[in-house]
């Protein structure tokens, strides 16, 4: 009985550490300041884990603010950079992928790019320097390499279930048996609930990566972990929509989890991942 | 093979305390969350909480927050539940269960009666 | 908490008839609903998890359809052997939470 003999699929190369601040002052987030000067500072961006530009106003603000890029750099950032974890196929799209140009509450000016899923196209964006989403590349050419379809328009799985990669949709057709599935989704929703370090409680939901679940949890107000949602519908998006089922000649097809009316489903085989 | 083995059937007087034994063996016991199922004789099913093996954190339904507690053994490969103040509604067989992500409660263990009886 | 009705609570049905389980949930779950089959003297056997999905080994005759607060169970060309207590459960959110069981039996 193939159910009795498990398989344990250990990821670790995609695995991302909790966030470790180096002064707690990097979890900050951007502060303009009351001023309304125009002046080019970085701040440390706790969700994408990189030093960012941002517009400071040139009074008051926080620790979180720095004069250059490569101070912002040394004062807050490890080597533990955030890792997206790439599909085989091309068109194989990580969910934010999917979310809509999001320049932020800043008012920089920054050019960035993004995936627009209804031109099916990566295009240039002006970017304020803080917030925003995950579609957001720093280049063309990284933003081209994770969203952009390849050369197919879709995949045929071993039930004759075709996924269309126009609107990433699931024809149903009946019951359905399992098949391996593999974590393709964001990087982050592997990363263990992260309260932060802060003293605040505010209800957040982070996703269980080893039941499958979105789960309550308390959140301290700042750093943490991007595993941290404000519904649990929100993190159901992100998260739980990542699995990729292998098929038999190698290829990989991405199925949507939590569609409306969607009645068939497929199910998943276990994937573990270090240290959780 | 994965195996969940249950203790023994309980015969306690009420007011006492019960601790109920699932062992388990055949996969990766911290990879899984264990949760424990209460069914009275001729009723339906209950679910009384979960706990997480590889750090011992559980999630208890309000049902039975002053009743059972769940801990776990590690060394052991063993999940525990203790009963506390035993009267005839806690008369039932318990099951404990794994989850298996996306699959459900695929298996179980065999069950144990406690009985409740003066 | 998430209540789950279930209905009937029993059914005979001859060998070989269709039979139809419903469960209605107090709010929306999306489709983690799981359904088993329990003989007397043993655990439940998962027939079918979230997504309506049918577990390897289980007949076809089982299936399962549903989403959001509605689902049907169905068994097509019942045999002797599907004589048992039926559940459906609800995994979207804690507490998880059972149907109170259909007694299915032949007629």
């Known amino acids: 009985d193939s159910e009795e003999d498990e398989e344990h699929t250990i990821i670790t190369d995609t695995e991302l550490p909790p966030l470790k601040l180096m002064h707690s002052f990097c979890a900050f987030k951007a502060d303009d300041g009351p001023c309304k000067a125009i002046m080019k500072r970085f701040f440390f961006n706790i969700f994408t884990r990189q030093c960012e530009e941002f517009i400071y106003g040139g009074c008051e603000g926080n620790q979180n603010r720095f004069e250059s890029l490569e101070e912002c750099k040394k004062m807050c950032t490890r080597d533990n950079a955030n890792r997206i974890i790439k599909t085989t196929l091309q068109q194989e799209k990580p969910d934010f992928c999917f979310l809509e140009e999001d320049p932020g509450i800043c008012r920089g000016y920054i050019t960035r790019y993004f995936y627009n899923n209804q031109t099916k196209q990566c295009e240039r964006f002006k970017y304020g320097g803080c917030l925003g989403n995950m579609n957001n590349f720093e280049t063309l050419e990284e933003c081209k390499n994770i969203c952009e379809d390849g050369p197919n328009g879709f995949q045929v799985d071993n039930y004759g279930t075709q996924l269309n990669a126009v609107n990433n949709s699931l024809t149903p057709q009946s019951t359905k048996v399992p098949s391996l599935f593999e974590f393709h989704g964001p990087s982050w929703c592997l990363t263990p609930a992260d309260r932060g370090l802060c003293r605040a409680n505010e209800n957040r939901f982070y996703y269980n990566s080893v039941i499958g679940k979105c789960r309550p949890f308390k959140y301290s107000g700042c750093g943490g972990n991007e595993n941290n949602f404000t519904s649990k519908q929100e993190c159901l998006r992100a998260c739980k929509k990542g699995f990729i089922q292998r098929i038999s000649k190698g290829g990989l097809i991405k199925t949507k989890r939590k569609r409306k009316k969607q009645r068939v489903k497929i199910a998943y085989e276990e994937i573990f991942v270090k240290n959780m | 093979q994965v195996q969940l083995q249950q203790s023994g059937a309980e015969l306690v007087k009420p007011g006492a305390s019960v601790k109920l034994s699932c062992k388990a063996s055949g996969y990766t016991f911290i990879s899984y969350y264990m949760y424990w199922v209460k069914q009275r004789p001729g009723q339906g099913l209950e679910w009384i909480g979960e706990i997480n093996p590889s750090n011992g954190d559980t999630n208890l339904n309000e049902k039975f927050k002053s009743k059972a507690t769940l801990t776990v053994d590690k060394s052991s490969s063993t999940v525990y539940m203790q009963l506390s103040s035993l009267t005839s509604e806690d008369s039932a067989v318990y099951y404990c269960t794994r989850w298996d992500r996306f699959d459900g409660f695929v298996y179980w263990g065999q069950g144990t009666l406690v009985t409740v009886s003066a | 908490e998430t209540t789950v009705t279930q209905s009937p609570a029993s059914l005979s049905m001859a060998i070989g008839g269709k039979v139809t389980i419903r469960c209605i949930i107090s709010t929306n779950i999306d489709d983690d609903i799981n359904w088993y089959q329990q003989k007397p003297g043993e655990p439940p056997k998962l027939l079918i998890s979230e997504g309506n999905t049918l577990r390897p080994g289980v007949p076809s005759r089982f299936s399962s359809s549903g989403y959001g607060t509605d689902f049907v169970f169905t068994i097509e060309n019942m045999l002797s052997e599907d004589v048992a207590d039926y559940y459906c459960?609800?995994?979207?959110?804690?507490?998880?939470?059972f149907g109170g069981g259909t007694k299915l039996e032949i007629k």
């Open positions: 459960l609800q995994s979207d959110d804690l507490p998880y939470t």
